[in-house]
């Protein structure tokens, strides 16, 4: 009956931690005799390529300083402890403990047995390193350039992770990588660039960073800031101001980042009316007459500029009572 | 403590057998197989085969397969072997030898001098 | 069947040399060799298995090498007890096979 090494074919483990490469002689056959087992690396230099041995009287044997006996352990063989004990040996099961990049690579697990031979099975080790990761947004403003307006950054990841973003902005992405702090590891930044505009002001943006460590993509919302001037309308004309009308008012409705820091209230015509008193965003007008017969200019300031909006205004002799139009903009 | 203890020289003419013997001790005899070696001086080291008393299976090497027959009896730990149609060719120190890790323990050898 | 050639029949060294036994297989046999001292009148007692692991209560002076098909037994600082026979064996395949020896003198 063959017998047959049972290996898997790559086995991945976190970098610092522990891993196990699962190594087992199937079936059992009665008389087959497994004299030693041996595990090594067959692509490392030649004075490092044995890894470990185990011989059922001495036990296990770790000659080589990488990764070395501190690191190194069979899981479940066992030697001959007396003349009443066999060594069990079909578990070949190799532990690697304190993960190094150095590790990574194809280990061979054989087993000697009489009177079948040799047969070996190899693993891939790969290790792995698990990102953390972080996006924040970037305090911009305003202009007619790409600027960076979030980060997102993958730190110390192996293999370096992928990182994308969702968003309906129109937006380009540039990644730079950089070795990380630990050996063999990545860092990867992704900055969301974008002319910033207050259209960006406070839209959130998701980055999505993928790595084979982890069960499903992090989804890490960000939140744009964008400095912005000010973005006005005016707001409350309903093109039925009439001669001593006096439920009117006009607002002035503001998107800004950061918050106004003034409004100020003016006719193109140069000629305010007295009837019409400024109350910050507000312009509440007392009675209307035919000095409304103007175009209102609100004009609003912020630490990053100013903003304005005009709205053209008709005085009727009488109210319309067809029924209220549309409200001006 | 594992011991190997073997039978002594033998002296015999040509064509005629021989049977040796090979009495093992301070290990569970049935889970190892036991090994026979020859040595002619000047000639290195030949494995002949091995015999495994846990269920008397043996298997040999093919160039001493119509020389030697291996045999064991769990009974009292010992394992046989015989050498047939003996001829000067035979003339050798024969070991048994437990197979361990390597062959780990070793008789002290059995001398076959096979002359007219 | 696989050949081990030990092409050195006899070797000379003087106490406190270094010497090397060498062992050719005919084919590729990993790392599956080992390697037996022999001193006259005894039974062969293992040195080094797996190429390159020493056997327990073996002097460090005793170190094997190699893989594939060239393997090799060095003795650092030989001393008189080394004055000995040595050889090389595979266990890679059914038939076992051992080299034909190399007998280390001392001068």
């Known amino acids: 009956q063959d017998v047959r090494v049972q290996v898997l074919p790559e086995v991945r483990g976190q970098l610092g931690g522990t891993v196990e490469l699962p190594c087992h002689l199937l079936p059992p056959v009665p008389g087959l005799y497994i004299s030693l087992v041996t595990w090594q690396r067959p692509d490392a230099p030649a004075n490092h390529q044995n890894v470990a041995a185990f011989h059922p009287k001495m036990g296990p044997s770790f000659p080589s300083p990488k990764p070395g006996s501190e690191r190194l352990s069979f899981v479940s063989a066992k030697q001959s402890t007396g003349q009443d004990t066999e060594a069990e040996l079909q578990d070949a099961t190799l532990a690697l403990h304190g993960l190094t990049v150095e590790d990574e690579g194809n280990y061979t697990c054989e087993f000697a047995t009489f009177p079948k031979g040799s047969v070996r099975g190899m693993t891939w080790l790969r290790v792995i390193a698990k990102p953390k990761n972080q996006a924040e947004a970037q305090k911009v403003t305003f202009s007619q350039d790409p600027t960076t307006v979030a980060l997102c950054i993958s730190k110390e990841g192996r293999p370096p992770a992928r990182i994308s973003w969702l968003s309906s902005l129109d937006w380009e992405a540039k990644e730079t990588q950089v070795s990380g702090t630990l050996a063999g590891t990545v860092t990867v930044t992704s900055r969301f660039t974008l002319v910033p505009s207050g259209r960006a002001d406070g839209v959130t943006v998701t980055c999505k960073v993928e790595h084979e460590s982890f069960e499903e993509p992090a989804l890490i919302p960000v939140t744009l800031s964008v400095r912005y001037p000010p973005e006005v309308s005016i707001s409350g004309y309903d093109d039925n101001w009439y001669l001593g009308r006096t439920d009117a008012t006009l607002s002035c409705d503001v998107r800004s980042n950061p918050e106004p820091t003034g409004y100020d209230w003016s006719t193109t015509s140069g000629t305010f009316p007295t009837s019409a008193v400024a109350q910050g965003s507000q312009l509440v007008i007392h009675a209307v007459d035919s000095l409304f017969n103007t175009t209102f200019v609100c004009t609003v300031t912020n630490a990053v500029g100013m903003g304005r909006a005009e709205q053209v205004i008709f005085v009727r002799e009488t109210p319309n009572t067809a029924g209220a139009g549309a409200t001006g903009g | 403590e594992v011991q190997l203890q073997q039978s002594g020289t033998v002296l015999t003419r040509p064509g005629a057998s021989v049977k040796m013997s090979c009495k093992a001790s301070?290990?569970?005899?049935?889970?190892?197989?036991i090994h026979w070696v020859k040595q002619r001086p000047g000639q290195g080291l030949e494995w002949i085969g091995a015999?495994?008393?846990?269920?008397?299976?043996?298997n040999y090497n093919q160039k001493f397969k119509a020389k030697a027959k291996l045999t064991a009896v769990t009974s009292t730990s010992t394992a046989y072997m015989e050498l047939s149609s003996l001829t000067s060719e035979d003339s050798a120190v024969y070991y048994c030898?437990?197979?361990?890790?390597?062959?780990?323990?070793w008789g002290q050898g059995t001398t076959l001098t096979v002359s007219s | 069947d696989i050949v081990m050639t030990q092409s050195q029949k006899f070797m000379s060294s003087s106490i406190g040399d270094r010497v090397s036994v060498t062992c050719k297989a005919s084919q590729n046999v990993g790392i599956n060799v080992v390697w037996y001292q022999q001193r006259a009148g005894q039974s062969p007692k293992t040195l080094i298995y797996?190429?390159?692991y020493r056997y327990s209560g073996v002097p460090d002076r005793f170190t094997g090498s190699g893989s594939g098909t060239d393997f090799t037994l060095t003795i650092s600082n030989v001393q008189s007890e080394d004055l000995a026979e040595y050889f090389c064996?595979?266990?890679?395949?059914?038939?076992?096979?051992f080299g034909s020896g190399t007998k280390l003198e001392i001068k």
């Open positions: 015999v495994y008393p846990g269920n008397s299976d043996s």
């Open positions: 797996s190429a390159s």
């Open positions: 064996q595979q266990y890679n395949t059914n038939p076992f096979t």
């Open positions: 030898t437990k197979l361990v890790g390597t062959f780990d323990y």
């Open positions: 301070g290990y569970i005899f049935t889970s190892y197989w």
